[in-house]
């Protein structure tokens, strides 16, 4: 049987009286081994026959003395089997063996949990020679024990290629509970139950857990470690911790904050990065996420023109990268822009609205009803048209660009004319007779040149022909009309 040494047990601070796992009353030691060092050692208990060699792992020497008497089997003497002490206390324990003097170079090594202890340990071996035998005492001391010193210690000695092994000495370092799992911060949905876990170990066991929420004890009766607390739901942020109690006292975990998920705050600092005629690139700074990751954002765009119908265009985008290009806008228009983002709980309010404008663009349509006719008397070609609708001018008209291409007998020549925005007619000189003139017109703004109208062709005869009816822009679906005069 393993014998035990133990420090005086202190009563459980919260639960006096018998309870599961309580320490038994200490026994008076049968034998207290002396120690030269100055620290207060743990008490050590030895069996009733301290000097009796054990029959475990023994070496029977083959050498005999002069009288030819066989030598007794070699074995470590029994010593204390179990030492219980508090963290940071000192401890010293030993192995002893009597070895016949015929054996030379006997060394004792210390092993812990199957691994040899080398180097920075306080192991001392003392030899006490006598006429026939030498008593060897190997001492092992630890000045300030830690939990990592817990374990089973043995001595080993090699003689005659035989290994002699001592009985184990179990060291049990007791202290305040040590957390192996503490509650963790969480973000939770309002009024929804969730779990927190707390686990602590001794020795000594048992370790009992109390939960604390906002400084109030949740469970007035302890729960054995590990403990899972089901929190029935929160309406506001709370701080939780757990207390771990054992016979040595209590340890308190870190306090963790449990936040309640909420809708996000509105984005801030919505700003214009770039504007074109039909798009605006915006960026924003997200608001507080409400303890729940953003999922996506919504850009709301409404025309700032007081005469507009006030309809809102909505563009959805991912929450990152806080940047969005709003497309399909009208040129030279004013818009109010707001941004809202959502998490799993819901949508934020809309950011403060900002005003933004698109720039001028090139017109999106060509001039309408283009007609061309030959004024032979002045040797000119007259061109007339209607300006594009204001909505589709995409800016302020600064004029028109007229392209006229002259083709005859394998020769082709394109000329461009710029005319001012006033009026809707132009006159160009005949460049070549007996040729086809193809005319196209585009509207021009500061934003650029719009599309050209469909081509209108007119044949310019040789000199002396009569001025006939004009050519005009065809109806949709008709291919290049040619009026031959």
């Amino acid at each position: 049987a393993i014998t035990e040494a133990r420090e005086e047990a202190k009563p459980y601070p919260l639960f006096p009286g018998p309870f599961p796992g309580s320490l038994q009353t200490d026994h008076t030691p049968l034998l207290s081994l002396p120690h030269a060092s100055g620290y207060q050692p743990a008490l050590m208990f030895s069996p009733t026959q301290p000097g009796r060699p054990h029959t475990g792992n023994v070496a029977i020497p083959q050498v005999t003395s002069v009288e030819s008497k066989p030598l007794p089997p070699l074995a470590f003497k029994h010593t204390v089997g179990h030492i219980i002490l508090s963290e940071h206390k000192g401890v010293k324990f030993n192995c002893s063996i009597s070895v016949p003097n015929i054996y030379q170079d006997t060394t004792i090594s210390w092993w812990k949990d199957g691994k040899e202890l080398l180097g920075a340990h306080h192991a001392i071996t003392q030899f006490y020679p006598d006429d026939e035998v030498t008593a060897i005492i190997a001492s092992f001391s630890i000045t300030s024990v830690q939990r990592s010193d817990n374990g089973s210690y043995i001595c080993k000695m090699k003689i005659n290629n035989e290994e002699i092994v001592s009985d184990p000495i179990y060291i049990e370092v007791q202290g305040l509970p040590h957390f192996t799992k503490q509650p963790e911060s969480m973000n939770v949905t309002r009024n929804t139950a969730f779990n927190l876990t707390c686990q602590a170990v001794g020795p000594p066991e048992p370790v009992n857990i109390f939960w604390v929420q906002n400084s109030s004890r949740v469970n007035e009766q302890p729960e054995k470690s590990p403990s899972v607390l089901t929190v029935p739901g929160l309406t506001e942020m709370a701080v939780f911790s757990c207390e771990a109690h054992n016979d040595k006292g209590l340890t308190v975990s870190k306090g963790v904050q449990i936040n309640i998920k909420a809708i996000p705050s509105p984005p801030t600092e919505v700003s214009i990065r770039n504007s074109t005629a039909h798009s605006i690139l915006i960026s924003w700074v997200p608001g507080f996420d409400g303890y729940s990751p953003f999922r996506n954002c919504s850009i709301q765009v409404k025309e700032a023109d007081p005469l507009s119908n006030g309809s809102v265009m909505i563009f959805n985008t991912s929450a990152l990268p806080h940047l969005y290009q709003i497309k399909q806008l009208q040129a030279l228009a004013n818009y109010s822009i707001g941004v809202s983002c959502m998490n799993e709980i819901g949508w934020s309010a809309v950011s403060p609205w900002i005003l933004a404008s698109t720039t001028e663009g090139a017109p999106s349509v060509a001039p309408l009803n283009v007609t061309v006719f030959l004024n032979e008397s002045s040797d000119n070609v007259d061109i007339r048209w209607m300006k594009p609708p204001t909505k589709q001018q995409d800016g302020e008209l600064v004029g028109y660009r007229i392209s006229h291409v002259w083709q005859s007998a394998g020769i082709s020549k394109e000329l461009l004319e710029e005319v001012g925005q006033n009026g809707s007619r132009a006159r160009i000189s005949v460049q070549v007779h007996n040729a086809t003139c193809t005319v196209r017109i585009a509207a021009v703004t500061r934003g650029g040149v719009g599309p050209f109208s469909d081509p209108v062709k007119i044949f310019i005869p040789a000199h002396g022909w009569v001025d006939y009816a004009p050519s005009s822009t065809p109806a949709p679906g008709n291919a290049d009309p040619v009026l031959i005069i």
């Epitope: 639960f15 009286g17 009024n191 007035e220 009766q221 302890p222 739901g233 309406t235």
Partner: antibody, heavy 118, light 106 residues
Framework: QVQLVQSGSELKKPGASVKVSCKAS????????LSWVRQAPGQGLEWMGW????????TYTDDFKGRFVFSLDTNVSTAYLQISSLKAEDTAVYYC???????????WGQGTLVTVSS | DIQLTQSPSFLSASVGDRVTITCRAS?????MHWYQQKPGKAPKLLIY???NLAQGVPSRFSGSGSGTGFTLTISSLQPEDFATYYC?????????FGQGTKLEIK
């Protein structure tokens, strides 16, 4: 199923003592605390305190310190309330209630009427 | 000690009515529990931790609130709901009960 069964009604003279029992069944007795609640005739509920069934340690509220004693016999899963030096104003129904996390009294005994009258 | 004040103390209502009982705490509490007591019977847990229905309690009962203000609502009164209702706080020892609200048939 969880049950708390209390002892029957008591009629006592002033100055006497009474001991009310509360026997628990349907759960592990030592895992939940036991509270005692008083209800005077026509009045509301008053929490008297509780006993830790794990350690046997009682806790009393200020109004119930002195003449009131909570005790246990864990072998028979029973809690006791003893009142000594009874007064007329101790006349009330006394309830035991199982006491869980967050101070919830989730199961109640049927109540014991203690009448103190000369 | 934290004082709990229930209002109203008496309430007359008819079957099918929606009724709300309020419990106000003298200082902030963590949770409020609600109990129902019928004459000559022990109290019965109705709602725990402000808004959680106890086992077997019909869904017409609901609870809400935080801090110092809490409510118990019965969405559509049934004949078996006529009783006295008590609130009880958790968050500060000693635990205290409200004075009760007696719900009577109109």
């Amino acid at each position: 199923q969880v049950q708390l069964v209390q002892s029957g009604s008591e009629l006592k003279k002033p100055g006497a003592s009474v001991k009310v029992s509360c026997k628990a069944s349907g759960y592990i007795f030592t895992t939940y605390g036991l509270s005692w609640v008083r209800q005077a005739p026509g009045q509301g509920l008053e929490w008297m305190g509780w006993i830790n069934t794990y350690s046997g340690v009682p806790t009393y509220t200020d109004d119930f310190k002195g003449r009131f004693v909570f005790s246990l016999d864990t072998n028979v899963s029973t809690a006791y309330l003893q009142i000594s030096s009874l007064k007329a104003e101790d006349t009330a129904v006394y309830y035991c209630a199982r006491y869980t996390n967050y101070g919830v009294f989730d199961y109640w005994g049927q109540g014991t009427l203690v009448t103190v009258s000369s | 000690d934290i004082q709990l004040t229930q209002s109203p103390s008496f309430l007359s209502a008819s079957v099918g009515d929606r009724v709300t009982i309020t419990c106000r705490a003298s200082s902030s509490v963590g949770y409020m529990h609600w109990y129902q007591q019928k004459p000559g019977k022990a109290p019965k847990l109705l709602i725990y931790a402000t808004s959680n229905l106890a086992q077997g309690v019909p869904s017409r009962f609901s609870g809400s609130g935080s801090g110092t203000g809490f409510t118990l609502t019965i969405s559509s009164l049934q004949p078996e709901d006529f009783a006295t209702y008590y609130c009880q706080q958790w968050g500060s020892l000693p635990f205290t009960f409200g004075q009760g609200t007696k719900l009577e048939i109109k």
